[in-house]
């Protein structure tokens, strides 16, 4: 178990011409808020459950009104983090969708307006417990800058938050340097001890006593940047073990390159060689490329070979959006005719037709009277997707099979007596009345 945390740093017009001045019009004040949706990045999640890892909503930002003519200030953003708790293991690779919503305030026809200003999506690798990762994403004319991290909630630990280490009430049962660890109360776990002197910033170990270097670093203790040629560094004291000069403090010490970038010294400063998907002076900017798999639901990614060139998602049928993240509501086009019910099955559309209609789109009006016989001289009348019989006198029912009592409806007025007759009915009128139904 743990928490994914997202911190929005800024949202505003991106660089370049045609960028909007502000998300609010000069006429109406508005405020922004953000919504984040997470899903495991390696599994092909169904479109119906895009937030399988969880979702979160920011507070509303302060009300902002654009002042015509004044320089556009930084937009006021909502306070606080967006936190998405996760119950199970952190997947390591995840997909995100961050939406920026605008709520317009003030009176207008149709009431308050709500608009999705920007939706950015991407796929990232992230170990729980690591430092904040910074990102910049562009959506249309807008630019969103944010940081994110995943952290485990005690007692969970590890890069996936799957190991449970819980302090016991009697820690002395474990020897010095050992920590008590669940699930077994009497099991004591030794913390992984790397080779003595192994750089905590640039080295790591998976077995006790070893020192493996992160990309860009070398040497037995991972303290030498890769670009430093052996024994040629002009700085620092001589090392007793190698006879080489050990680098003294330089611009690459502490590796200023973020996100696994490797640092190399230049005459004036340093230069970062960034891994794919990152750029910037310190590899702090993440540009989404096709390698990041930004297209959801089987979309085909084209272009975007490097972070500076845009990618385009070609969406499969049934999906739309810049990242194919939206399911097309194909039934809204009302493809089923004659009152048929539209069913979007994802892979296909189906029309459930009303009685009397058929065809893929219910376009065929069936002959309701075909094969339908009306008994006792009745005639079939088509209509409304069902057949109906107009029965001869003296018969009734759906198929004119029932003998009808013509006097049941009391057709004779003014107290006249009704008699059923083979040809219909006869009224015997009370004194003073006449007519077929004693109506006069």
């Amino acid at each position: 178990a743990g928490v994914f945390e997202l911190q929005i740093h800024s949202f505003g017009p991106g660089p370049g011409p045609g960028a909007p001045r502000s998300p609010c019009s000069a006429r109406l004040p508005c405020r922004l808020f953000f919504r984040v949706c997470l899903k495991p990045g390696l599994s092909e999640e169904a479109a119906e459950s895009p937030c399988a890892l969880g979702a979160a909503l920011s507070a509303r930002g302060p009300v902002y009104t654009e002042q015509p003519g004044a320089p556009a200030p930084d937009l006021p953003l909502p306070d606080g983090l967006l936190q998405v708790p996760f119950r199970d293991a952190w997947p390591g690779t995840f997909s995100f969708i961050i939406e920026t919503w605008r709520e317009e305030l003030g009176d207008q026809i149709g009431g308050p307006a709500w608009s999705l200003l920007a939706r950015v999506a991407g796929r990232r690798r992230l170990a729980a417990g690591g430092p904040w990762a910074r990102d910049i994403q562009r959506a249309g004319a807008w630019e969103l800058r944010f940081s994110y991290r995943a952290r485990c909630e005690p007692p969970a630990v590890g890069t996936a938050c799957t190991r449970l280490c819980r302090p016991r009430s009697a820690p002395s049962r474990c020897g010095p340097g050992l920590r008590p660890c669940a699930p077994l109360e009497d099991e004591c776990e030794a913390p992984l001890v790397c080779r003595a002197g192994c750089s905590p910033e640039h080295g790591f170990c998976e077995q006790p006593g070893e020192c493996r270097c992160l990309e860009g670093w070398t040497g037995p203790l991972c303290t030498v940047p890769v670009s430093t040629s052996s024994c040629l560094s002009p700085r620092g004291p001589s090392s007793a073990t190698t006879g080489c000069l050990v680098p003294g403090p330089g611009p690459c010490d502490g590796n200023p390159c973020a996100n696994g970038g490797s640092c190399s010294e230049t005459p004036r400063s340093f230069e970062c060689t960034c891994p794919r998907g990152f750029y910037g002076l310190r590899c702090e900017v993440s540009g989404v490329t096709c390698a990041d798999g930004p297209c959801f639901n089987g979309g085909l990614c084209v272009g975007g070979a490097d972070p500076d060139s845009a990618y385009i998602c070609h969406c499969p049928p049934g999906f739309q959006g810049s990242n194919c993240e939206k399911r097309v509501d194909r039934c809204s086009l009302q493809p089923c005719r004659n009152g048929g019910l539209c069913l979007d099955l994802g892979h296909a559309l189906r029309c459930r037709c009303r009685a009397g209609f058929a065809g893929p789109r219910c376009e065929h009006d069936l002959d309701d009277c075909a094969g339908r016989a009306c008994a006792n001289g009745g005639t079939c009348v088509e209509g409304g997707g069902a057949h109906r019989c107009s029965c001869a006198l003296g018969f009734g029912g759906r198929d004119c099979r029932e003998r009808a009592d013509p006097c049941a409806a009391r057709p004779c007025a003014h107290g006249g007596r009704c008699y059923a007759h083979f040809s219909g009915l006869v009224c015997a009128c009370a004194p003073g009345y006449m007519g077929a139904r004693c109506e006069f």
């Epitope: 895009p50 709520e103 709500w114």
Partner: nanobody, 125 residues
Framework: QVHLMESGGGSVQAGGSLRLSCVAS????????MGWFRQAPGKEREGVAF????????YYGASVKGRFTISQDNAQTTVYLQMSSLKPEDTAMYYC??????????????????WGQGTQVTVSS
């Protein structure tokens, strides 16, 4: 697509109460707003009450404010309209509406892409 099913309509005396329900099914995770419109014979469709699901914000038409209350369940797939102090002029067909659109005006029917069949409410004096 989101499918909507209304219930709870009926006949009631003036001053009485009714509770309408609208259950959404289908792609409900995309619901941004849900609410109720009504239409009396010979009149235009009128916005009654709405809840913007993404924030839980509620809105009411001027003619029902203070008498009607809209709410949603925890799963955000059902909305309820509690109608109190009903008047004869509340008589109409009540339609549940839902929006999965990226832009919508709360009281404008154009912003809603899913509609229920309607449930009749009749208030007699």
């Amino acid at each position: 697509q989101v499918h909507l099913m209304e219930s709870g309509g009926g006949s009631v005396q003036a001053g009485g109460s009714l509770r309408l329900s609208c259950v959404a099914s289908g792609n409900t995770y995309r619901l941004n707003s849900m609410g109720w419109f009504r239409q009396a014979p010979g009149k235009e469709r009128e916005g009654v009450a709405f809840i913007v699901m993404i924030r839980g914000t509620t809105y009411y038409g001027a003619s029902v404010k203070g008498r009607f209350t809209i709410s949603q369940d925890n799963a955000q797939t059902t909305v309820y309209l509690q109608m109190s102090s009903l008047k004869p002029e509340d008589t109409a067909m009540y339609y549940c509406a839902a929006s999965t659109k990226d832009q919508f005006y709360v009281f404008n029917p154009i912003g809603y892409d899913s509609w229920g069949q309607g449930t009749q409410v009749t208030v007699s004096s």
